[in-house]
């Protein structure tokens, strides 16, 4: 049962990671700049995201603007967008692969094939986690590097936004969940069934048995 429990935990973590990744990509809070000081202009906070930027006035009023022209955007922003979308799609693909190989599904009858599919889904989730990590870390690096940006003065330093923390959490969950799914697969996929067969049955080869004939706990 421990193996099944780890699988469930792994897929729950990856699902949480995927949701976190989606929210992180969508929210315009990758870079946060506070404009507060002696001015005729109302103090404001600027949120910059992958798809839009928002200005929040101290009065509570918020204005958001979607970036219009794709070509006019900085290349690192375009790359971050692409990686975010790819990471989410890769994770979805991983989920489909997992569902095909999950214990509770009958898409694949063969035990070894099921184990391989779960292992593959784990690897795919780990890849998705790494893909999520790249734009988040790159953006964080860019914010820290902003010390040298002529546009960003001392009182207007960009800070790490909530989306980056969500992105790190998403990446961690995807890596952890994917890792758990990889760990639930024993190195010898057919070892469990053959032991069972040797001890309790000599009447039929393992390959001829149906998926529900043996206790689930013996299988990946």
């Amino acid at each position: 049962m421990a193996s099944a429990g780890m699988q469930i935990l792994g897929v729950v973590l990856t699902l949480l990671g995927w949701v976190n990744g989606l929210v992180s990509c969508a929210l315009p809070m990758w870079k946060v700049t506070a404009f507060i000081g002696n001015s005729i202009v109302v103090a404001q906070v600027v949120w910059e995201g992958l798809w839009m930027s928002c200005v929040v006035q101290s009065t509570g009023q918020m204005q958001c603007k979607v970036y219009d022209s794709l070509l006019a955007l900085p290349q690192d922003l375009q790359a971050a967008r692409a990686l975010c979308v790819i990471a989410l799609l890769v994770a979805l693909f991983g989920l489909l692969v997992y569902l095909a190989g999950a214990k509770c599904t009958t898409c694949v009858e063969e035990k070894d094939s099921k184990a391989r599919l779960v292992l593959t889904s784990g690897i795919v989730f780990v890849i998705s986690g790494v893909l999520t990590l790249i734009p988040v870390c790159w953006t964080a690096h860019a914010i820290i590097r902003d010390f040298y940006n002529p546009l960003v003065a001392e009182a207007q330093k960009r800070e790490l936004g909530a989306s980056l923390y969500l992105g790190w959490a998403a990446s961690g969950l995807l890596l952890l969940g994917g890792g758990l799914l990889c760990c639930t697969c024993p190195s010898g996929g057919s070892q469990g069934p053959s032991h069972y067969m040797a001890r309790y049955s000599t009447s039929a080869p393992a390959i001829s048995r149906g998926p529900s004939e043996y206790p689930t706990k013996n299988y990946v």
């Epitope: 000081g37 001015s39 005729i40 204005q63 603007k65 022209s69 960003v152 001392e154 207007q156």
Partner: antibody, heavy 117, light 107 residues
Framework: QVQLVESGGGVVQPGGSLRLSCKAS????????MNWVRQAPGKGLEWVGL????????IYNQKFKGRFTLSVDKSKSTAYLQMNSLRAEDTAVYYC??????????WGRGTLVTVSS | DIQLTQSPSSLSASVGDRVTITCSAS?????LHWFQQKPGKAPKLLVY???NLPSGVPSRFSGSGSGTDYTLTISSLQPEDFATYYC??????????FGQGTKLEIK
């Protein structure tokens, strides 16, 4: 109270050089970028460039890159616009303006530069 | 470079009139601001980020618009409002440009 005061304008011959100053007071000088904007007589406003007093970083309007140079002296809370190879069409009032949250919120009164032989 | 075109270039109106000045950009802008300039004076910030009024600017001034088309409206002209008005854009990349100006004169 935020105040910007330009100085250094005057009459200069074509091909000559001039350095304009913008003395800032009433706020943390290194906290905000400083822009330079010019206005030819009877004409509209034209953005020249900006400098970040915090790190000395500059961005220029390509039209002026090479001939105009922006600099700062943090100890004097002063921004400078060095203009070389001046032409008749550079005759204008030159303003410095503080940048606050992508907005030019405070402007100096301007200093007139006349390029004439 | 993003070009800003203001219309009209000049406008005659009377005290109490409602006046509208438009600013059209050649492509979408991130921030659009309006400035008022009186003869011999430096420009003064009038509206920032499309529709926000700095402290000290009367509420008869208002701004609106999005994308490439923006508007400055003076609901009821006062004698001190006769001046030249400029729009200015801030996009992702410089240079940041100004409109050619709209001169508001007394009729």
């Amino acid at each position: 109270q935020v105040q910007l005061v330009e100085s250094g304008g005057g009459v200069v011959q074509p091909g000559g050089s001039l350095r304009l100053s913008c003395k800032a007071s009433g706020y943390s000088f290194t906290g905000y970028t400083m822009n330079w904007v010019r206005q030819a007589p009877g004409k509209g406003l034209e953005w020249v460039g900006l400098i970040n007093p915090y790190n000395g970083g500059t961005i220029y309007n390509q039209k002026f890159k090479g001939r105009f140079t922006l600099s700062v002296d943090k100890s004097k809370s002063t921004a400078y616009l060095q203009m070389n190879s001046l032409r008749a069409e550079d005759t204008a009032v030159y303003y410095c303006a503080r940048d606050y949250g992508f907005v030019l919120d405070y402007w100096g009164r301007g200093t007139l530069v006349t390029v004439s032989s | 470079d993003i070009q800003l075109t203001q219309s009209p270039s000049s406008l005659s109106a009377s005290v109490g009139d409602r006046v509208t000045i438009t600013c059209s950009a050649s492509s979408s802008v991130s921030y659009l601001h309006w400035f008022q300039q009186k003869p011999g004076k430096a420009p003064k910030l009038l509206v920032y980020s499309t529709s926000n009024l700095p402290s000290g600017v009367p509420s008869r001034f208002s701004g609106s618009g999005s994308g490439t088309d923006y508007t400055l409206t003076i609901s009821s002209l006062q004698p001190e409002d006769f001046a030249t008005y400029y729009c200015q854009q801030r996009s992702i990349y410089p240079p940041w440009t100004f409109g050619q100006g709209t001169k508001l004169e007394i009729k």
